[in-house]
Interface confidence: medium
């Protein structure tokens, strides 16, 4: 996260760190005790094998994420229409071998319901252990930052992403740059608060550099995928 | 909701398992038309920021809120399971319907042990004037939002 600040305990209790061989690779969001939402590009082959992955919940610092405190992944489900070139439908689910125990530091985020109206410049938050500057290293502590939703029409304008944004994507950040998600934040949450409830609006997907002017962050539009998510959960049950 | 990203025309609804399209009037009508039977298990949804429980009506080809009349938490648990939540039922309550709905789904309490949406029938009235708000999991609460001033 560029331009953010270190997170307080329990502020983003749905945030998980997803590790491969003891290294943070991507973020994710808890939606039930067993299911994590992340980005499909995080689990491209060969990382589509669940045994590669360990999830860490409720821990703010990477150096406290040792093997025994993690949760092994049992199943990885990538969206069937994910396109690795365009990053369209960039969403995936992970099912944990053992369910998480919820507490003050580990809680699920709400999936958005149909009929939820978002303002054109709705205030949202992003969080993750990604780089705090472009080409930087993974952060030791969880960081978070405020961003604004950017209308797809503006985001698709010639001076921004020139029609690369599909209905399965959502843009957030600031056109002047300075605040953004970055490498290592992928799969993590873009959330907003409505009715004193936090909703998962997006999963961190892609961008051109980090925090550059006219290059905001692009997120998977979770609203489009809620039905797909429920179908996977139901089929597994 | 279930129409999002469908390959079918506006009037058709896609089966996950086969990609074939079926008529909206065959969706949630009590008979499986999709090879995987998913046309009969995607019949409930939560709507809007107040988690209003809605059920799909094959007759009217649209979603309608469930009236609070005769509702009980057992039905809430069943609806949550229908959506894919396992063992995580949280709460259901009646809330005043401010959406201006004129068509509701009501429980037929004398119906046997059948899927929840099969116990529901159409009604243009809801005597409790409240619709079911259903939470399947205690989600979206962080330490900041749970510390409310007194």
């Amino acid at each position: 996260i560029v331009g953010g600040e270190s997170a307080l305990p329990g502020a983003w209790p749905w945030q998980v760190s997803l590790h491969v061989q003891n290294v943070h690779v991507c973020g994710g969001s808890i939606i039930t005790p067993e299911w994590i939402v992340t980005a499909a590009h995080c689990v491209e082959k060969p990382l589509n094998n669940p045994w590669h992955w360990t999830a860490f919940a409720g821990i703010l610092r990477q150096s406290f994420m040792f093997y025994g405190a993690g949760y092994q992944v049992e199943k990885v489900i990538s969206h069937p229409n994910y396109d690795s070139k365009t990053k369209n439908n960039d969403i995936a689910l992970m099912k944990l071998q053992k369910p998480l125990t919820f507490n003050d530091l580990v809680k699920p985020v709400c999936l958005p319901n149909p009929g939820m109206m978002l303002q054109p410049e709705q205030l949202c938050w992003i969080s993750g252990w990604g780089a705090t500057e472009e080409k930087g290293k993974t952060s030791e502590v969880l960081n978070a930052a405020k961003v604004l939703l950017i209308e797809t029409q503006r985001c698709n304008s010639r001076y921004v992403y020139d029609n690369l944004i599909t209905p399965a994507m959502i843009c957030a950040g600031f056109l002047q740059g300075n605040v953004d998600s970055c490498q290592g934040d992928s799969g993590g949450p873009l959330v907003t608060s409505k009715n004193n409830i936090w909703w998962l609006i997006g999963d961190t997907s892609w961008g051109s550099g980090c925090a550059k002017a006219y290059r905001p962050g692009v997120y998977g539009n979770v609203m489009v995928f809620t039905d797909w998510i429920y179908r996977q959960m139901r089929a597994d049950g | 909701w279930k129409f999002m990203g469908s390959k079918c025309s506006n009037s058709g609804i896609e089966c996950d398992s086969s990609g074939t399209c079926i008529n909206p009037s065959n969706w949630c009508d009590g008979v499986s038309h999709c090879p995987g039977g998913e046309d009969e298990n995607r019949c409930v949804r939560l709507y809007g920021p107040n988690f209003i429980l809605q059920v799909y009506s094959s007759q009217r080809k649209s979603w309608h809120p469930v009236c609070q009349d005769d509702w009980s938490e057992g039905y809430g648990r069943a609806a949550c399971q229908d959506m894919g939540y396992r063992n995580s039922f949280y709460s259901s309550q009646g809330i005043v319907d401010d959406s201006g709905s004129t068509s509701f789904m009501k429980l037929n309490t004398s119906a046997g042990n059948v899927d929840i949406y099969k116990k529901l029938y159409h009604s243009d009235a809801c005597s409790s004037k409240a619709v079911v708000s259903l939470r399947c999991i205690a989600c979206g609460v962080n330490l900041n939002s749970s510390r409310q001033s007194r």
């Epitope: 305990p9 409720g58 703010l60 025994g68 405190a69 949760y71 507490n103 530091l105 030791e140 | -």
Partner: antibody, heavy 121, light 111 residues
Framework: QVQLQQPGAELAKPGASVKLSCKAS????????MHWVKQRPGQGLEWIGL????????NYNEKFKSKATLTVDKSSRTAYMQLSSLTSEDSAVYYC??????????????WGTGTTVTVSS | DIVLTQSPASLAVSLGQRATISCRAS??????????MHWYQQKPGQPPKLLIY???NLESGVPVRFSGSGSGTDFTLNIHPVEEEDAATYYC?????????FGAGTKLELK
């Protein structure tokens, strides 16, 4: 109030094993990791290892990997440390201490009363 | 592992005077705006007691005569004015990473 209760003393023979307990009260047991610390008479503090009560999977100081085994019983809110193949070097006071891992700060804010282990034939 | 070196090993201070204890880490224990160094007091027959966390934050219930400072590799615990009940051994501890380690301790005596 928050307390970690440990038995006062344990006597064991060389080569034997001993299982120390640490009963927690006054807080949410699963929200804190439990650590164990050794202190030999007149010496400093030595970290043995930790156990997250949620997952039950422990992490050890290399020096104690073959000496200590940490477990928890969530239902009784008790953490245990088993010390095996005891020698006189294991005679020490053993403390359990809770650590608020979620705060990211990692300090020991509450300590157990300590158990004195004496290894003697 | 990060090694913490405390100095002096012991010191004798008169009532009302200042006691200064130093702790040096073999590598920086500061990151992301925090210094992960903490101080404990231990009296004979008792478990250690947390005094200062994150280099300079006073644990609740600890008298304000205790203060901590420092960042990176060099940290200091100050006690001023020293009172009779402060006679004890003081330990620094880092939590920059696992394993957490302790300094060897500084024994404070009253003259």
């Amino acid at each position: 109030q928050v307390q970690l209760q440990q038995p006062g003393a344990e006597l064991a023979k060389p080569g034997a094993s001993v299982k120390l307990s640490c009963k927690a009260s006054g807080y949410t047991f699963t929200s804190y990791w439990m650590h164990w610390v050794k202190q030999r008479p007149g010496q400093g503090l030595e970290w043995i290892g930790l156990i997250p009560p949620n997952s039950g999977s422990s992490n050890y100081n290399e020096k104690f990997k073959s000496k200590a085994t940490l477990t928890v019983d969530k239902s009784s809110r008790t953490a245990y440390m088993q010390l095996s193949s005891l020698t006189s070097e294991d005679s020490a006071v053993y403390y359990c201490a809770r650590w608020d891992y979620g705060s990211s700060y990692g300090y020991f804010d509450v300590w157990g009363t300590g158990t004195t282990v004496t290894v003697s034939s | 592992d990060i090694v913490l070196t405390q100095s002096p090993a012991s010191l004798a201070v008169s009532l009302g005077q200042r006691a200064t204890i130093s702790c040096r880490a073999s590598e920086s224990v500061s990151t992301s705006g925090y210094s992960y160094m903490h101080w404990y007091q231990q009296k004979p027959g008792q478990p250690p007691k947390l005094l200062i966390y994150l280099a300079s934050n006073l644990e609740s219930g600890v008298p304000v005569r205790f203060s901590g400072s420092g960042s990176g590799t060099d940290f200091t615990l100050n006690i001023h004015p020293v009172e009779e009940e402060d006679a004890a051994t003081y330990y620094c501890q880092h939590s920059r990473e696992l394993p957490p380690t302790f300094g060897a301790g500084t024994k404070l005596e009253l003259k």
